[in-house]
Interface confidence: medium
Amino acid sequence: RGVFRRDAHKSEVAHRFKDLGEENFKALVLIAFAQYLQQCPFEDHVKLVNEVTEFAKTCVADESAENCDKSLHTLFGDKLCTVATLRETYGEMADCCAKQEPERNECFLQHKDDNPNLPRLVRPEVDVMCTAFHDNEETFLKKYLYEIARRHPYFYAPELLFFAKRYKAAFTECCQAADKAACLLPKLDELRDEGKASSAKQRLKCASLQKFGERAFKAWAVARLSQRFPKAEFAEVSKLVTDLTKVHTECCHGDLLECADDRADLAKYICENQDSISSKLKECCEKPLLEKSHCIAEVENDEMPADLPSLAADFVESKDVCKNYAEAKDVFLGMFLYEYARRHPDYSVVLLLRLAKTYETTLEKCCAAADPHECYAKVFDEFKPLVEEPQNLIKQNCELFEQLGEYKFQNALLVRYTKKVPQVSTPTLVEVSRNLGKVGSKCCKHPEAKRMPCAEDYLSVVLNQLCVLHEKTPVSDRVTKCCTESLVNRRPCFSALEVDETYVPKEFNAETFTFHADICTLSEKERQIKKQTALVELVKHKPKATKEQLKAVMDDFAAFVEKCCKADDKETCFAEEGKKLVAASQAALGL
């Protein structure tokens, strides 16, 4: 089977059940339902999934049975619309149920919430978790899928199955270990961090498809796959791009069964054709399906073919440039992007896309000019400033990171971004700036040749988080502008923002800066978040505060927390010393 099946199926639900197997079918339906109805209790979802699974089995037995010919959207949508508390729990989302497919599914998609009002996941004691795991392994793992899926409504479903497999393996191994906690906790931390990163990366793919269209996603995929598979022919890369686009379009559209099935087919195709794709796939292709697909997605770049000719010959010097462009614009631009990307694993994908856009704009202008060749002869010179801008930015920020360390680097970014877009909510500014700050430890350790693809493509993922969170409750025209004008220029757009001079400082509220003894029992990370929240609020109160003023206040704050956490009567200390700290801070900042 190729990724595009042309064989007709009487029953789509039976077809997917047979392709995926019962276990994966149930897991994917649970993920789909939890991503749509994010507030529903676990037990309600399990009941719905069991009903769908039983129905699927009747269709496997007899594809002509009643309703088996219905589309998956119709079947799943009908099932979701049976939820009794839909109106009370989800408000206007209940109106989706009055619509017909495909409008009903589009309506459900529009109501996915990137920041659902759900309690933070608290990790129970290791013994409690191990008991729950042993008592009912199936329910324990389903609960994991449910909790992740409802908090991350765009999580890449087939990849979530891979995470669940690792989650199960961690418990299977560690619940038998002598020191369960020492074995389990680092594994769970790793899964949590990787899961958040995976969710954010997929969110960017979905935003790319949904906000900027298939062409934008395909351009991204051509660039990335050409970097990864520089020995593959252009036609091969194009085929992979088409198939990958289909997979991600399906997952982003809530078609998780089709997506998982097509992703498996794509992995199969890649492994069957690895000789013409990449020499780095051998190990990946020996793994079981979920591991194989994950491995292929993360595989290192293959070596560039030796003696690749100069790009200028075909794309600048050739007399056929305008003719080839006119013949098939997107193919010619695709070839340009492919040829440029395979030669530049040292560039970020977004930079490659900026170069391709510049090239396209130049050809559009020049191929209608009196002397096209003279007009576009210097097009590669226009690339120089585009390449140097991220190089310089990364150099400066890595120097700052090495000087300050991660926490203080995050603080510098918090101040920078709060001054740029002070209207954005404090939790969003803290979350985004903390993640932006992680670029330092993630990428600055790399040699020059790997820094830009690591840093700028990571920043694209993080800034997309800002964009999707801001879209839910838009408060800043500047954020909206940077988020919507151009996908590939988001980072330069935010970088170019200066202090927002139109911002009216927030009224001072002592309550914002009142702390209690509970801060002492927080983890180091949570304590940092408290301090960073205070820092953002300070900047919102006094946007013109200097670095030195802010540093002095933050140092006093750190000393105050340390002092009161050592005090015998912590609560009294926080109350009395807190008042003094607020007064001193107001004086220091001239509030």
């Epitope: 194009s238 013949e327 193919v331 695709g334």
Partner: antibody, heavy 119, light 111 residues
Framework: EVQLVQSGAEVKKPGESLKISCKGS????????IGWVRQMPGKGLEWMGI????????RYSPSFEGQVTISADKSISTAYLQWSSLKASDTAMYYC????????????WGQGTLVTVSS | QSALTQPASVSGSPGQSITISCSGI?????????VSWYQQYPGKAPKLIIY???KRPSGVSNRFSGSKSGNTASLTISGLQADDEAEYSC???????????FGGGTQLTVL
Amino acid sequence: EVQLVQSGAEVKKPGESLKISCKGSGYSFTSYWIGWVRQMPGKGLEWMGIIYPGDSDTRYSPSFEGQVTISADKSISTAYLQWSSLKASDTAMYYCARLHGVVSRGDYWGQGTLVTVSS
Amino acid sequence: QSALTQPASVSGSPGQSITISCSGISSLAGSYNLVSWYQQYPGKAPKLIIYEVTKRPSGVSNRFSGSKSGNTASLTISGLQADDEAEYSCSSYAGRNAVAVFGGGTQLTVL
């Protein structure tokens, strides 16, 4: 306004030569490919070949290679389709089309030239 | 013999929807959505109604829509009207340095 105007209908005998024309106006003639399409009586459309008037690069469909010649004179914004020796099976309606962006997309068409070859 | 395959004829009643398929699209044409559809009335020049698989030129009714799955493209006409009765042909890019190809054409009859 973009227009493609083709020369009038022709009645010829087998073995004779013929050159029909397609004049473009209202756009930059040298920046777009021109395609020629044959439609035999009661049959479907067939792409015969394409030409880029900017440099006269010409490509033919395999079944028309050596059977016809496509040319262009950019100074008068005109493309041509010619036969050196007509056959009865060349009887058909011939259309020219401006190809926008990709060769499979003819966005403006001539009105057609009917060629009849009969002894 | 065309490289693209279409049904010779389809028919439908006014108000109904019909779909015409076009199989044999090359993978490169598929990757870049290089498929067009033309409408032709007897004795008239073809008219572009869909390009790049799904796009409609301005002035073309939104009753006409295009889609693609794998190596098959489809043209759907909804709310069929008497003046939709015509020949419909698909055309696809045949690869760099090659000439495009047409499908054999499909005669639509409105009953």
